[in-house]
Interface confidence: low
């Protein structure tokens, strides 16, 4: 039974773990006095880490800075000072280290240059930071270099003078392909989308920008939208918020063909002080937040159909503070269809909500077993778990980390939380779910940093404390039992845990510094758990697990979005290595269709607590404002449309008379009168 966690009790204490870990703990002391450290992993499964330390002394007129660059190729066990490879140059930390996609081995560091120089300077490596080439730029970069996802030799950057610069040879040579550019993004197939201002500046022309596209790295251009406020890419959708003709409101328009044709999204328009935000998007659908009028701090989540056009209201009073502000919206990547977020209730308290079906229905998080409701609860026996995420962190609550889940650690979600009627400002505890958020248990008392290793085979945690620490905790049974390991005799001021992205590694690096009266020294301890998980997992170590199972007796048990998935999961009792090549084994099976597998199409809605879609009464005999492609085609519907990503077959097929909606269609989206095609000579 999953109760409160046990630490070093009769909990299957691992034999000789202290000796095994001591032999696999590697200390590295950094011989510099830097004020900040940034760390980047280069490539996947390469073991290469770059560490940039910076030391800045602000003087009256200029600031004097010094950078040091270190490289490890054994997951952080040993580091080599490679500052000489960048000519001891001061690196601008605000640009970070631009690491190339996948395993390209490419790295770009942007250097600080003196005031009068013609352009910026970068150091480029294409061999996992073994060597760097210094390149002087013909412009001063405003943003970090952006790699094309399809070809890491193709780079784009904006200059401080709003020029759009492109390189086709990994930054060796650069060409300015357009001026007056406000925002630029890579799309699919090396397409670049960007907005330009026509009259004054990006800020002054907000709402009067043009959206352009180039498919050939700047040889030719096409204007694909006008009166643009902003644009974004999500999944296979291109979104633009477009100013209305009549007033200062704006509306979202959607394209699924890179801007050749647009449709107006069936979403409320927003005023000047409001905003739209794409919370999440995949190849099937999008979660869109629409801000409420006024400075409320909340809005509404809508989920789209497969075209990104028809939207269903998903969640009211969704917490989202301001444009670019804080939202707790979290995609639980360890289980399909699961998202967690926060709502702001009438009394201004914040409550966590979870959806298991991609936004179809939201509910409170189940109260962890054996937990007591805190002071926020009216009824001491009935309450729920509330998760601390970005908003709590921004409010400086004692929450060192956001919720954590990993696609290859199936079902595991770790988060800080409190148990009551709303999020509490009291010191939180750490909770874990092993089933994607259906059930929860307290994992650790008080705030901790945590990370997942070996695809869930090991969970590592470090207590969040303002005192120096020297203990790391780890669990090999998904957080039920914990062992403590003293990784150093000299406690350090802890600054962060670092493990290779993807949670496949068995190494964890503990970063911090030691401080004496005069000096501060950076230090890292890398602990390798390979000897704790001595053997490779075998077939017997895994057990099948039906995801989303809530009623094993029901033939539709586990059906989410038209199919169920059985996973092979490591038994909690098995202490073995999943290994770096571990692939999540899952067996999907299709479910029969029911009305739950369909959303309501244009002009239809579901009355409260009903499953059938009925025609919207206000549209009977009226014109439809929302139109596909702004034209009169494809406007027939039977009122239902399959939910994006739903794979159900057979069963219930909502058949009814097909209505012709062409007669009701009006769209006022102004596509550019003639979609200009231009050549860049």
């Amino acid at each position: 039974r999953r109760g409160a966690p046990a630490e070093d009790q009769d909990c299957g204490r691992l034999p000789d773990f202290i000796a095994k870990l001591t032999n696999n703990t590697h200390q590295h002391v950094f011989d510099d006095l830097s004020g900040s450290v940034s760390l980047s992993w280069v490539g996947d499964s390469t073991g290469v880490i770059l560490v940039l330390t910076t030391f800045q002394v602000p003087l009256v007129i200029v600031s004097f800075g010094q950078s040091k660059l270190y490289r490890s190729e054994d997951y952080g066990k040993n580091f080599k000072d490679i500052t000489n490879l960048i000519n001891n140059t001061f690196i601008r930390t605000e640009f970070g280290m631009a690491i190339g996609p996948e395993n390209s081995g490419k790295v770009i560091l942007t250097a600080e240059v003196s005031g009068g120089s013609r352009g910026g300077r970068v150091f480029r490596s294409s061999d996992f930071a073994k060597n760097f080439v210094q390149t002087d730029l013909p412009f001063h970069p405003l943003t970090q270099m952006m790699y094309s996802p399809q070809n890491s030799d193709y780079l784009l950057a904006l200059s401080t003078e709003n020029g759009l610069w492109v390189s086709k040879n990994f930054g060796e040579k650069w060409e300015e392909i357009h001026k007056a550019v406000c925002l630029a993004k890579w799309g699919p197939n090396n397409i670049i989308f960007f907005t330009t201002h026509v009259n004054g500046s990006c800020k002054a022309d907000l709402g009067a920008l043009e959206l352009w596209r180039t498919s050939d790295l700047g040889k030719t251009f096409k204007t694909i939208g006008v009166k643009i406020y902003s644009f974004g890419l999500g999944g296979r959708f291109l979104f633009a918020s477009v100013m209305a003709d009549k007033d200062t409101t704006r509306r979202i328009h959607v394209s699924t063909d890179q801007g050749d044709t647009w449709s107006m999204a069936q979403l409320p328009s927003v005023g000047q002080e409001q905003f739209y935000s794409i919370l999440a998007a995949n190849e099937d659908m999008v979660f869109m937040h629409v801000d409420e009028p006024g400075d409320t701090g909340f809005g509404t989540i809508f989920t789209s159909d497969d075209r990104g056009i028809v939207y269903s209201k998903s969640l009211d009073r969704h917490l989202y503070t301001t444009t670019g502000g804080e939202t707790d919206f979290t995609n639980v990547t360890s289980l399909r269809g699961v998202y967690i977020t926060s709502t702001l209730s009438e009394d201004n308290s914040i409550q966590s909500m979870i959806t298991f079906d991609q936004g179809g229905r939201w509910e409170h998080l189940r109260k962890p077993e054996n937990s007591k409701c805190d002071a926020t609860a009216k009824n001491k026996n009935e309450c729920s778990l509330h998760i601390h995420a970005s908003y709590s962190i921004s409010q400086k609550l004692n929450v060192p980390m956001a919720p954590l889940s990993e696609p290859n650690a199936v079902g595991i979600v770790i988060a800080h939380g409190s148990v009551g009627d709303a999020i509490s400002v009291m010191v939180p505890d750490v909770y874990i779910s092993d089933d994607g958020g259906y059930s929860w248990a307290k994992m650790l008392e008080g705030p901790h940093y945590y990370t997942i290793l070996d695809s869930g085979g090991i969970i590592v945690a470090i207590e969040h404390s303002n005192r120096p620490i020297n203990v790391i905790k780890f669990s090999t049974d998904e957080g039920q039992c914990w062992q403590s390991y003293v990784f150093t005799q000299e406690p350090i001021y802890f600054t962060g845990l670092a493990s290779e992205p993807g949670a496949r590694s068995m190494n964890i690096s503990i970063w911090g510094f030691t401080e004496s009266f005069i000096t501060r020294q950076w230090v890292s301890y890398t602990v390798d758990f390979k000897d704790i998980l001595e053997r490779n997992c075998e077939e017997d170590d895994y057990t099948t697990w039906l995801a989303h199972s809530t009623d094993p007796g029901d033939y539709k048990d586990g059906c989410i979005l038209g199919y169920k998935e059985q996973f092979l999961r490591l038994r909690k009792s098995s202490v073995c290595q999943n290994g770096r090549d571990y692939v999540v084994a899952k067996q999907p099976s299709v479910c029969p269709c029911s009305l739950e597998d369909f959303l309501c199409d244009f002009g239809y809605f579901r009355p409260e607590n009903a499953s059938e879609c009925v025609e919207q009464p206000e549209l009977k005999g009226h014109e439809l404002e929302f139109c596909l492609y702004g034209k009169e085609e494809h406007l027939t519907t039977n009122g239902y449309r399959k939910i994006p990503g739903d794979k159900c077959q057979g069963g219930m097929n909502p058949a009814r008379e097909v209505k012709d909606l062409k007669k009701k269609c009006t769209s006022n989206f102004l596509n550019p009168t003639k979609q200009n095609s231009k050549s860049n000579s």
Epitope: Q480, S549, D551, P552, K572
Partner: antibody, heavy 129, light 107 residues
């Protein structure tokens, strides 16, 4: 309702093989493992092995390795246990038992702990010359 | 393999008595322990899983406790239908071994 129905009693000569069947009904066959347990006359229970009907993978107790084969037929929701090279000490009642280690139960408390919750009526196998 | 040792191997008790049976594992098995009841000529019946969780339909006079290596099955007030043999079984790692059994007889 959920039930497991086993084949009838068998009398075999030493050295022969026996194949016992266990037909499942009332639940999703591929969602639960199936264990086989035997009980010699006047003795205790002895676990022989387990099969995952979904993929057909098996795990046998060392004692029976090389002599036991567990298979399944998903079209008829039936699992089989075949024991070869029979000797007199194999005389026992053989049980199949549904083993929910292969499924997440509804409540969090039971999600990873489980027992063999449904048993067949048993098949008596007598080995005698 | 993990050895499961049950004690006593048999006991005599009267209706209404409180009965305790213990089971010890040769190594820690966390809470992966089940208890079964078997009556002559019948298949075993699951009583307790996960050391302390009562299987649905089992009377509440049966309870289980323990974790690690030492476990206990308690019948708070023995009823006539409770006279049977009781087995513990570990479900921690294969092979899923059983204890030798405890026969509860009428005094």
């Amino acid at each position: 309702q959920v039930q497991l129905v086993q084949s009838g009693a068998e009398v075999k000569k030493p050295g022969a093989s026996v194949k016992v069947s266990c037909k499942a009904s009332g639940y999703t066959f591929t969602s639960y493992y199936m264990s086989w347990v035997r009980q010699a006359p006047g003795q205790g229970l002895e676990w022989m092995g387990i099969i995952n009907p979904s993929g057909g993978s098996t795990s046998y107790a060392q004692k029976f390795q090389g002599r036991v084969t567990m298979t399944r037929d998903t079209s008829t929701s039936t699992v089989y246990m075949e024991l070869s090279s029979l000797r007199s000490e194999d005389t026992a009642v053989y049980y199949c038992a549904r083993d929910p280690s292969g499924i997440a139960a509804a409540g969090p408390a039971s999600r990873y702990y489980y027992g063999m919750d449904v048993w067949g009526q048993g098949t008596t196998v007598t080995v005698s010359s | 393999d993990i050895q499961m040792t049950q004690s006593p191997s048999s006991l005599s008790a009267s209706v209404g008595d409180r009965v305790t049976i213990t089971c010890r594992a040769s190594q820690s098995i966390s809470s992966y322990l089940n208890w079964y009841q078997q009556k002559p000529g019948k298949a075993p019946k699951l009583l307790i899983y996960g050391a302390s969780s009562l299987q649905s339909g089992v009377p509440s006079r049966f309870s289980g406790s323990g974790s690690g290596t030492d476990f206990t099955l308690t019948i708070s007030s023995l009823q006539p239908e409770d006279f049977a043999t009781y087995y513990c079984q570990q479900h921690y790692v294969g092979p899923f071994t059983f204890g030798g059994g405890t026969k509860v007889e009428i005094k």
